[in-house]
Amino acid sequence: PEPPTACREKQYLINSQCCSLCQPGQKLVSDCTEFTETECLPCGESEFLDTWNRETHCHQHKYCDPNLGLRVQQKGTSETDTICTCEEGWHCTSEACESCVLHRSCSPGFGVKQIATGVSDTICEPCPVGFFSNVSSAFEKCHPWTSCETKDLVVQQAGTNKTDVVCGPQDRLRA
């Protein structure tokens, strides 16, 4: 018969023959022959292969380096890599999460639109008219200006995006 030019799913072509790939969690030791099946071996401790493969070496589990602010979010298995995340107050610098940086704080005049997570930084927004923030914070939203009217007071000093309004007593009409 004609040697194959393509193989079925979970097979690979070698020496004009279709051999079975090794299942996830196992590596290739020897190719199949006309008389023998593909020989595979389980990955060792702290190693993994996450797909049907013909790799002769397993991948090392990712190391979540605490010196880079990393910690283990999910321990790796023979079929999955370790997933790292960042310590509290820090977030990953890339999709692969290889290092962490401190969450940014929103400066006075800006409030937190979205609090940071282990994988995304703080998102700040400028305080709109009627709101202010007088602190640098990774958690504080813009606060509304104090309503002097509800306290039977009047505005003595207008608010800005960084300061609250200053309320004072209403001027008494002189006799």
Partner: antibody
């Protein structure tokens, strides 16, 4: 220091067999898959084939039968059985990241093969 | 065979700007992330920038960022510098296909 160096590239006439050699230093061929990639003048990169740590060779469909990859303990060879003018290119020997056959982190400088009558 | 299609073929960018290069695989790469990005300058061999779609290779500046999964991938270069002028290639891998590895056609980045 881990390095690769290709040799054997020269001007040959069509049909004249040619063997390119990749000499490795600083690492063991029992730990790394080795791949050949070529690049025709002014063109893109083309994956040719690889030989893995247990000595199994895999080829691009267009390269099967036209090229043979083999290795010793310190070198990898690419034999061009019957070159044509379309095989004129710089041939790179490359090393993969362990376990990642498509991620080539060490490249040789390349050797130029010119096939012309 | 897995086929990699890169767009655009050429891109002109100013210093300090951000450039995005796309790479599409004809079928899902292994583990949905077996994709690498390379940078090549004239007269030099290519240099590995990113592997497994988003992992930065040793010594590569964090201005280079890889993202994507399955069949759609992106290389983003932010704060472009003159030294980034080069041709960039993606390469995908799928063990079940005869042509297990394949390169994209390349994207030339010109820095103004």
């Amino acid at each position: 220091c881990q390095s690769l160096e290709e040799s054997g590239g020269r001007l040959v006439t069509p049909g004249t067999p040619l063997t390119l050699t990749c000499t490795v230093s600083g690492f063991s061929l029992s730990t790394y898959d080795m791949t050949w990639v070529r690049q025709a003048p002014g063109k893109g990169l083309e994956w040719l084939g690889l030989i893995n740590t247990i000595g199994s060779a895999y080829y691009a469909s267009w390269a099967s039968g036209r090229f043979t990859i083999s290795k010793t303990s310190t070198s990898v060879t690419l034999k061009m059985t019957s070159p044509t003018t379309e095989d004129t290119a710089t041939y790179f020997c490359v090393r993969g990241v362990p376990g990642y056959s498509s991620s080539f982190n060490i490249w040789g400088p390349g050797t130029l093969v010119t096939v012309s009558s | 065979a897995i086929v990699m299609t890169q767009t655009p073929s050429s891109k002109s960018v100013a210093v300090g700007d951000t450039v995005t290069i796309n790479c599409q695989a004809s079928e899902s790469v292994d583990s949905n992330k077996r994709l690498a990005w390379y940078q090549q300058k004239p007269g030099q061999p290519p240099k590995l920038l990113i592997y497994t779609a988003s992992t930065l290779a040793s010594g590569v500046p964090s201005r280079f960022k890889g993202s994507g999964s399955g069949t759609e991938f992106t290389l983003t270069i932010s704060d472009v510098v003159c030294d980034d002028a080069a041709t960039y290639y993606c390469a995908g891998y799928k063990a079940t296909t005869t042509d297990a590895s394949a390169f994209g056609g390349g994207t030339e980045v010109v820095v103004k």
